[in-house]
């Protein structure tokens, strides 16, 4: 089972408030995107597995001066048990693949949605 901010998935329970807010922020970013997100900045792709929150933060923290994802960065830090600083990398990064921040956010959102639906949809 994948631990998702305080509950196990699959399972018939909705997310914690903090995780719900993260999902909503990712939705806001993807739906309200007008110009290229973070000026088209590229970040390391990650393996969307058990430690994905820390890995996502480690990837996104290297993007500076982008107000659109600052809230997401703060939220992700709440799900990562250790302090993350720029330039830090874990084994969860796909080090040979860089993608745009917009795609990174979309992939993360899609993965979270899949995780929640797993417990409810057959």
């Amino acid at each position: 089972l994948t631990c998702l901010g305080g509950f196990a998935s699959p399972g018939p329970v909705p997310p914690s408030t903090a995780l719900r807010e993260l999902i909503e922020e990712l939705v806001n970013i993807t739906q309200n995107q007008k110009a290229p997100l973070c000026n088209g900045s590229m970040v390391w792709s990650i393996n969307l597995t058990a430690g994905m929150y820390c890995a996502a933060l480690e990837s996104l923290i290297n993007v500076s001066g982008c107000s659109a994802i600052e809230k997401t960065q703060r939220m992700l830090s709440g799900f990562c048990p250790h302090k993350v600083s720029a330039g830090q990398f874990s084994s969860l990064h796909v080090r040979d693949t860089k993608i745009e921040v917009a795609q990174f956010v979309k992939d993360l959102l899609l993965h979270l949605k899949k995780l929640f639906r797993e417990g409810q949809f057959n």
Partner: antibody
């Protein structure tokens, strides 16, 4: 703007099947679940089930399991609800509605499709 | 299955009066409760989500409160167009369930 447009009213005989369509527009179809809710004349709202158009995964109200089938066609952004072995008490208005994730609210609704089951 | 019980079944009030609608869940659903309004011949319309969150385009006279098992929809001052049936919905877990509705009628 977001729209869910349903097929027209239908009259069926007991024991027959009905298939109601729901065409989505104004948003990315695979980003939202499609849920089906029905309302018998003068009665309240009853949730029937849901489909994730991206994967085809479904969830059903136990009451309709085995009798209802939910499908979605990504190429046409259309969801379908088929109900078999119709009875007179299946006479109702059937609504499709979208939900981002199951715990979200139903923010947009189709106009409803009246299905009348009568001999 | 989470059962939602709405009360009263019918509320007879005059325009300008305050309407208080109740919805009680059979078990704790946190704030995963949504409210809808339905007028005759129309599809339901979302009013309030997550128990108290307002929807853009919905008049400020509609407000929601509560958490756990007890929830309230309040219409601060009834307008003629507010006379309708109101439903609460459980968003906590499948099967999604709805209350039996409260009809707000003109006194």
């Amino acid at each position: 703007q977001v729209q869910l447009v349903q097929s027209g009213a239908d009259v069926k005989k007991p024991g027959a099947s009905v298939k109601v369509s729901c065409k989505a527009s104004g948003y990315t179809f695979i980003d939202y679940e499609i849920h089906w809710v029905r309302q018998a004349p003068g009665q309240g709202l009853e949730w029937m089930g849901a489909i994730d158009p991206e994967t085809g995964g479904t969830a059903y109200n136990q009451k309709f399991k085995g009798r209802a089938t939910l499908t979605a066609d990504k190429s046409t952004s259309t969801a379908y609800m088929e109900l078999r072995s119709l009875r007179s008490d299946d006479t109702a208005v059937y609504y499709c509605t979208r939900i981002l994730l199951y715990y979200y609210p139903m923010d947009y609704w189709g106009q409803g499709t009246l299905v009348t089951v009568s001999s | 299955e989470i059962v939602l019980t709405q009360s009263p079944a019918t509320l007879s009030l005059s325009p300008g009066e305050r309407a208080t609608l109740s919805c009680r869940a059979s078990q704790n659903i946190s704030d995963y409760l949504h409210w809808y309004q339905q007028k005759p011949g129309q599809a339901p319309r979302l009013l309030i989500y997550y128990a108290s969150q307002s929807i853009s385009g919905i008049p400020a006279r509609f407000s929601g409160s509560g958490s756990g098992t007890d929830f309230t929809l309040t219409i601060s001052s009834l307008e003629p167009e507010d006379f309708a049936v109101y439903y609460c919905q459980n968003g906590h877990s499948f099967p999604l369930t709805l209350g039996g509705g409260t009809k707000v009628e003109i006194k």
